[in-house]
């Protein structure tokens, strides 16, 4: 039960995280104009990964896409790549984790397969979250560097008469969305990995020894069976937890939820 809850919660947290990573990647407010020097500006600039926008106090907003690839800073390209890789890995992870969910039955999929898929999706979520956090952090670092560089030469005067105020940019909402979303995806991935441990069949835990009355051989039965003697009228070895509903020599098409202790 705890395993199913952990897996389900991990899936939901990762889903929210990936939705957040997608939202952050699409958002225009990765960097916003610093209003410290001029809080009542009539023109407000903000930039995203894909376009830059200008909002005028008149109510008009104009956005322009970055229609060049080669002309863009390498750091921006790197951030774009990290965010896209994060989204792709996250999306694949979500797809894999849907089939790995314990509460969903697909054909005759064994728990070991589900455990592997859960682990795979968990790792994908962790890498996806790390990509998002790395992308946002690289962009934030770029902003901090540029901020202090522009502060150093904020006013470039012409003989002290005319001032050209350089626009400084600070952290936009998308950065915070990205950090939180990346964190959530990472946490979701860790939860999936934890759930995987609980799902995996631990074959070394119990060895069931079956003693037959004839004494011809000793059969070692892997799985969660407890040893039971074959003496007396009860020649069939019953399993411990299912009240004798199914016997050892019945064919099991897939493991039941009672099979593991």
């Amino acid at each position: 039960m705890a395993v199913t809850a952990c897996q389900g919660l991990g899936f939901v947290v990762s889903l929210i995280g990936i939705a957040g990573i997608i939202a952050a990647t699409c958002m225009d407010q990765w960097s916003t104009q610093d209003l410290y020097n001029n809080p009542v500006t009539a023109v407000f600039n903000y930039q995203g990964l894909w376009r830059s926008c200008v909002r005028e106090s008149s109510g008009f907003t104009e956005c322009r896409g970055y229609f060049t690839l080669l002309g863009l800073p390498a750091m921006l390209q790197a951030v774009r790549a990290l965010m896209i890789v994060g989204i792709v890995l996250g999306a694949i992870g979500l797809l894999v984790s849907i089939f790995a969910l314990k509460c969903i039955r697909i054909g005759s999929m064994e728990d070991s397969a589900k455990a592997n898929m859960t682990l795979t999706s968990g790792i994908m979520f962790i890498v996806s979250g790390l990509c998002a956090i790395a992308g946002v952090s690289v962009f934030a670092n770029m902003l901090v560097t540029n901020f202090w560089m522009s502060t150093a030469n904020m006013y470039t005067g012409m003989g002290g008469m005319v001032q050209t105020v350089q626009t400084r940019y600070t952290f936009g909402a998308a950065l915070f969305v990205g950090w939180v979303a990346g964190g959530l995806t990472l946490i979701g991935g860790v939860m999936m990995c934890i759930a995987c441990r609980g799902l995996a069949p631990e074959e070394t835990n119990y060895k069931a020894v079956s003693y037959h009355a004839s004494g011809h051989s000793v059969a070692y039965k892997p799985g969660g069976f407890k040893a039971s003697t074959g003496f007396g009228s009860n020649t069939k070895n019953k399993k411990i937890y299912d009240g004798g509903a199914r016997t050892e020599d019945e064919v099991q098409s897939y493991p039941s939820k009672h099979d593991y202790v």
């Epitope: 600039n45 008149s58 109510g59």
Partner: antibody, heavy 118, light 113 residues
Framework: EVQLVESGGDLVKPGGSLKLSCAAS????????MSWVRQTPDKRLEWVAT????????YYLDSVKGRFTISRDIAKNTLYLQMSSLKSEDTAMYFC???????????WGQGTSVTVSS | DIVMTQSPSSLTVTAGEKVTMSCKSS????????????LTWYQQKPGQPPKLLIY???TRESGVPDRFTGSGSGTDFTLTISSVQAEDLAVYYC?????????FGAGTKLELK
Amino acid sequence: EVQLVESGGDLVKPGGSLKLSCAASGFTFSSYGMSWVRQTPDKRLEWVATISGGGSYTYYLDSVKGRFTISRDIAKNTLYLQMSSLKSEDTAMYFCARQSRGNAMDYWGQGTSVTVSS
Amino acid sequence: DIVMTQSPSSLTVTAGEKVTMSCKSSQSLLNSGNQKNYLTWYQQKPGQPPKLLIYWASTRESGVPDRFTGSGSGTDFTLTISSVQAEDLAVYYCQNDYSYPLTFGAGTKLELK
């Protein structure tokens, strides 16, 4: 057709109050920033105040801050300028104007005259 | 506050003549975000409210004759009337639309000889 009609101008004593109105028609009122601009007797233009489309942001000339209040009633398509503690230097023709691209004022009313004198 | 300085204060011209008037700002009106200059030109005829001619320093408002041309960038701007007509006699104001308070120049009065 875009129309802006100001009203409420009057002769008032220093320290008095006055409320100017500007009835707007012919455009989506809530989509545009609106401003009050005054023209002094020596024909100088002076921006007074601006309110954003939704009414969330207001901007004022320093000399009128705390004395004048710009507001808008979206339902009535009307812009207001509440003026209090009036001074003789507030004497002017007051125009309401619609802000457009580039923050430029593309439509102006005919103006309403405010005279502050004892 | 950004100070707008217009020159000359008045111009006496003959019909058909080319006219240029200047406007200088104490700070750059160029916005780095969209590379546009937030400078506006208005025309005001006696007894009328100002009329928008040019915004973004060089973009002509719809309905404005193409004899009116705005140019310049940063802090120095110019309004040019390629061939003055009688109906162009008015006062021309430039305005800072980049930073509050929005400030106007004192105006350039265009008169006929």
